[in-house]
């Protein structure tokens, strides 16, 4: 099953995806698309990166993180009911059966109505329990839900990452863990790849 | 250390073409993208394209990919950029710069001297 | 083409003022923003990296923050040493895109 992230209208919604380079500056190409992840490729794709870049994205997606480093976490930008649904992020690794594929369901809630206050305004109501992720703008948050196991394969840097965020201590209060599969791999096209 | 050592200043007449060349040394030249920056009298940076020296795979700005060549030379480190159809707006000071992550995801970043070229007539 | 648009385009502040430029990326462009001085007759020199990152023997006076598309430069107490122009460059989607550059003079 696919691990779900929430946001609420007018957010930015941000989908976590990471990879090791095998080297500084070993890019790997990585597309995003909206959909499951199809045999090949990405479907509808809204971001891809190539050796070097950014190479392509559509409007209200893009990369907060560093991607030369393996980050390429998704930022949806000011999300709509609309943009509810699973998200792919495929790591196309060289070679042939070697892509790195993850489905990632973003489920976006109504924003939150409050009545204008009278006094001061109860902070608490009006903003449930967030969390902000290292590295990203104060609006990036994401509304902790009973977060489910996270099953992604072979990728140390997404430890890391949370070992370095508050993340950490909110996955570990819902007692979510992160469990290694390589039920993801799948056979795609070969990519030119070049080390540098 | 590194150094980044261009050729001299030229002056061609419009129409004409210059190739100018870019010495790499104390690092793995093979290892990151040599980068082409101009920069005309009391203006700004303009990026004018990449290649990398591994398999010379590159990528120009647009506005250049008509008249530029970039190439390298592996065995002498050296990286040249070549300009054809010269106008007298590409009168600049010609810059070679390399850049990206290094070992322990250092960020490595050096420039040439930079190569003044004149087109006048 | 991403576009940088760079205010102010110059600056006069006193020694030991704190000076502050900023960075508009026309869009999102996430962390990787590098910040450059130069003055007359050398080359540029990488001041700032990746936003925030300070580039090796830069001294902690400079500064850099933002990231998607506003972004901000600061030098602390400026010095004499620190007379140039200052330029932003957007390194997330090429072309590489440069800001028009802000020069910053000593009253």
């Known amino acids: 099953s696919e691990v779900e992230y929430r946001a609420e209208v007018g957010q930015n919604a941000y989908l976590p995806c990471f990879y090791t380079p095998a080297a500084p500056g070993n890019l790997v190409p990585v597309c995003w698309g909206k959909g499951a992840c199809p045999v090949f490729e990405c479907g509808n794709v809204v971001l891809r990166t190539d050796e070097r870049d950014v190479n392509y994205w559509t409007s209200r997606y893009w990369l907060n993180g560093d991607f030369r480093k393996g980050d390429v976490s998704l930022t949806i930008e000011n999300v709509t009911l609309a943009d509810s649904g699973i998200y792919c992020c495929r790591i196309q690794i060289p070679g042939i059966m070697n892509d790195e594929k993850f489905n990632l369901k973003l489920v976006i809630k109504p924003a939150k109505v409050t009545p204008a206050p009278t006094r001061q305004r109860d902070f608490t109501a009006a903003f449930p329990r967030m969390l902000t992720t290292r590295g990203h703008g104060p609006a990036e948050t994401q509304t902790l839900g009973s977060l489910p196991d996270i099953n992604l394969t072979q990728i140390s840097t997404l430890a890391n990452e949370l070992r370095d965020s508050r993340l950490a201590n909110d996955l570990r209060d819902s007692g979510a863990t992160i469990r290694g599969s390589s039920d993801y791999k799948d056979d795609d096209d070969k990519h030119h790849h070049h080390h540098h | 250390q590194v150094q980044l050592v261009q050729s001299g200043a030229e002056v061609k007449k419009p129409g004409a073409s210059v190739k100018v060349s870019c010495k790499a040394s104390g690092y793995t030249f093979t290892d990151y993208y040599m980068n082409w920056v101009r920069q005309a009298p009391g203006q700004g940076l303009e990026w004018m394209g990449d290649i990398i020296p591994n398999n010379g795979g590159s990528k120009y700005n647009q506005k250049f990919k008509d008249r530029v060549t970039m190439t390298t030379d592996t065995s002498t480190s050296t990286a040249y950029m070549e300009l054809r159809s010269l106008r007298s707006d590409d009168t600049a000071v010609y810059y070679c710069?390399?850049?990206?992550?290094?070992?322990?995801?250092?960020?490595?970043?050096?420039w040439g001297q930079g190569t003044l070229v004149t087109v006048s007539s | 083409d991403i576009q940088m648009t760079q205010s102010p385009s110059s600056l006069s502040a006193s020694v030991g003022d704190r000076v502050t430029i900023t960075c508009l990326a026309s869009?999102?462009?996430?962390?990787?923003l590098a910040w450059y001085q130069q003055k007359p007759g050398k080359s540029p020199k990488l001041l700032i990296y990746a936003a925030t990152s300070l580039a090796d023997g830069v001294p902690s006076r400079f500064s850099g923050s933002g990231s998607g598309t506003d972004f901000t430069f600061t030098i602390s107490s400026l010095q004499p040493e620190d007379i140039a122009t200052y330029y932003c460059q957007q390194l997330y989607s090429s072309p590489w895109t440069f800001g028009g550059g802000t020069k910053v003079e000593i009253k």
């Open positions: 869009q999102p462009i996430g962390i990787w």
């Open positions: 710069a390399t850049w990206g992550y290094g070992s322990s995801y250092r960020w490595f970043d050096y």
